[in-house]
């Protein structure tokens, strides 16, 4: 059909930078590159119907369904979703194509379904059908990668049994310590499953899919390095594969490496050796100890020995199920308003944890750093000096852990007042929790020095706002103070704040803050 317009349907995935919800046709977002949805003519349909490829969207993801129409003249349009018409505002791009967009913000189950776009151009009418569904991430998994020896080759295969199929990459680094951080120039990444170059200093394999990224480091003992001051420890669960690499460099080839478990040499078939000459003509040997599926009796001290280097050992511990070891007692901190401070949790865990820090129902990303002693640490510094309860939550496949922290910020009280016909109340959030005084202002006491003690009711910690205590004091009105100005003052070790209230005046109460 010569009259049919050229139509392009695209999907644009957005990285959300706003928490608004709704549909809109012009919404500022960070965008990914558009994905062509094909838009083919649907056969045997009454009228001209184009069908876009089905769209699967993650829960809470934001997308734009977009149609580009290459047809002469103006176009008008209408979106229909679940029998409701939705506003449609076409515009023209630089190539003079008609552009119609539907933005779906923070995808939910209710926004899944068929989106019909009716377009009327000067030449013809046609319909475009989009089917949007929520991706079933319940079936998704991301498993930590593990290593296998490649059959008949001196190479390692990295395997991650994940859904959807993950992208596997080797992360290699040839320098020591801090310079092997992920974004360092010393780090080389290879997007492949098989690795032949096994002589590097630091070797990790990472797998990533829609659920994130998981990495496994090739546990290495380097006989040319001074041993760690704490015993290197490797945890594994029953049935997982064990891989330990022993590496040594010497001026010539005249040395050999051996592995022992406790005092017995490893059985043949549980190790393999590789060697190469380095650029300065020294010999590098590596000896792998491996067990394809560990059992409890594979626990013990694995010692790598050399005829030209001092031996080094690591403790391999096989556990039935994963664990998270840390002290879960709650911790309270009291800091000044500008004091630098971070919460921190030290833990030992296997497998590696996923964690979050939460404050005031908002979650923050959680970073963890391995320490030399086999422990890890997670710190949270982004509290912006907001007092309240902070929660650290960690979990792995087998265990969960939660720890509570309370942050108190030392500051002078701030007073808010409110009054009714029968009483006046003052509130303060200073810390340490303030004490209260009420004073009456009269002819006899123009400076408001006459203290009121009758009818005062103090409540420490009246309401708890995400762990932030608020103190209040209420004055019940008596004939003796009606029509007078009264002053409530909150004071702690950092200062005093007061608020003056006119009692029993008609209309809204005037409050005078005098600090």
């Amino acid at each position: 059909n010569q009259d049919l317009p050229v139509i392009k349907c695209v999907l644009i995935n957005h990285k959300n930078n706003d928490s608004s919800v709704g549909k809109s046709s012009s919404y500022p977002m960070v965008s990914e590159s558009p994905e062509d949805l094909g838009c083919a003519l649907r056969p045997q349909s009454s009228g001209t119907v184009y069908e876009a490829a089905a769209v699967e969207v993650d829960v809470s993801a934001s997308i734009t369904l977009q149609v580009l129409v290459d047809a002469p003249g103006n176009i008008s349009c209408l979106w229909v979703f679940k029998h409701s018409s939705l506003n449609c505002q076409p515009h023209f791009d630089l190539q003079n194509r008609g552009v119609v967009s539907m933005v779906i913000l923070k995808m939910t189950e209710t926004q899944a379904g068929e989106y019909l776009l009716f377009i009327q151009s000067e030449a013809t009418n046609y319909t475009i059908l989009f089917t949007v569904s929520i991706r079933n991430t319940l079936l998704y998994t991301l498993r930590r990668p593990y290593f296998r020896k490649m059959e008949n080759q001196d190479a390692l295969v990295c395997i991650s049994e994940s859904v959807p199929e993950p992208i596997v990459e080797w992360v290699l680094c040839d320098s020591q310590g801090e310079s092997c951080k992920e974004e360092s120039p010393a780090v080389v990444k290879k997007e492949e499953k098989v690795l032949h170059e096994l002589f590097g200093t630091d070797i990790r394999c990472c797998a990533r899919n829609e659920l994130g990224r998981e990495c496994t480091r090739l546990f290495t003992i380097d006989l040319n390095q001074t041993p760690q001051t704490t015993l290197p420890q490797l945890f594994l669960k029953v049935g997982e594969p064990l891989w330990i690499r022993c590496k040594a460099v010497h001026v010539n080839h005249g040395f050999g490496l051996t592995w022992e478990l406790e005092n017995k040499a490893l059985e043949e078939g549980n190790y393999f050796e590789m060697s190469t000459y380095s650029t300065n003509r020294t010999m590098i040997r590596i000896l792998f100890a491996f067990v394809s599926s560990v059992a409890r009796n594979d626990t013990g001290y694995y010692t790598c020995s050399s005829s030209k280097h001092p031996s080094q050992s690591a403790l391999v511990t096989i556990v039935e199920k994963g664990f998270i070891n840390a002290t879960n007692s709650s911790e309270d901190y009291e800091i000044d308003q500008y004091e630098e401070f971070c919460f921190s949790v030290r833990f030992k865990a296997y497998p590696q944890i996923r964690c979050t820090w939460t404050f005031s129902r908002k979650s923050f990303p959680c970073e963890q750093k391995g320490l030399d002693n086999g422990y890890s640490i997670s710190k949270f510094c982004n509290h912006k000096h907001q007092p309240g309860e902070y929660i650290f939550h960690a979990e792995n496949d087998d265990a969960q852990f939660t720890k509570m922290f309370t942050l108190n910020i030392r500051r002078k009280p701030q007073v808010l007042a409110e009054a009714s016909a029968s009483q006046a109340s003052c509130f303060s959030d200073g810390y340490p929790l303030p004490s209260w005084t009420w004073k009456k202002c009269s002819d006899k006491s123009p400076n408001c020095t006459e203290e009121i003690t009758e009818g005062v009711w103090n409540r420490k910690a009246n309401r708890k706002v995400f762990g932030q205590w608020v103190s209040s004091s209420t004055l019940n009105m008596s004939e003796a103070i009606k029509g007078f100005l009264v002053k409530c003052c909150a004071y702690n070790s950092l200062g005093t704040s007061c608020e003056t209230i006119l009692l029993n005046s008609p209309g809204p109460f005037p409050f005078i803050q005098d600090n």
Epitope: P227, P232, N263, T303, S305, S306, S307, P310, S311, S313
Partner: nanobody
Framework: QVQLQESGGGLVQPGGSLTLSCTAS????????FAWYRQAPGKQRELVAF???????TDVESVKGRFTISGDNDKNTAYLQMNGLKPEDTAVYYC?????WGQGTQVTVSS
């Protein structure tokens, strides 16, 4: 885990001698996996001498001909015989065996 206990450190004049001992407990013992390290103030821990997998004792260049490592399997003990001591040998000396470290013994060479 193995427990290691060093002894024999002390103050000695340049040119003098000391013998350090390191006794292991809590594990079956094999002298082949023993090593001595030292750490001078403000410096990294460094290797001094070790017994290799084939039972040979090896010293690093800076102590060659002056220090000797040996051991007694029956007594679960390794030794470091130090002769011709120099002020630059001043350090805390540690023994290492199968992933475990002793708590260290101070050797001070001074006139």
């Amino acid at each position: 885990q193995v427990q290691l206990q060093e002894s024999g450190g002390g103050l000695v004049q340049p040119g003098g001698s000391l013998t350090l001992s390191c006794t292991a407990s809590g594990s079956t013992f094999s002298i082949n996996h023993f090593a001595w390290y030292r750490q001078a103030p403000g410096k990294q821990r460094e290797l001094v001498a070790f017994i290799s997998s084939d039972g040979r004792s090896t010293d690093v260049e800076s102590v060659k001909g002056r220090f000797t490592i040996s051991g007694d399997n029956d007594k679960n003990t390794a030794y470091l015989q130090m002769n011709g001591l120099k002020p630059e040998d001043t350090a805390v000396y540690y023994c290492y065996y199968r992933g475990s470290w002793g708590q260290g013994t101070q050797v001070t060479v001074s006139s």
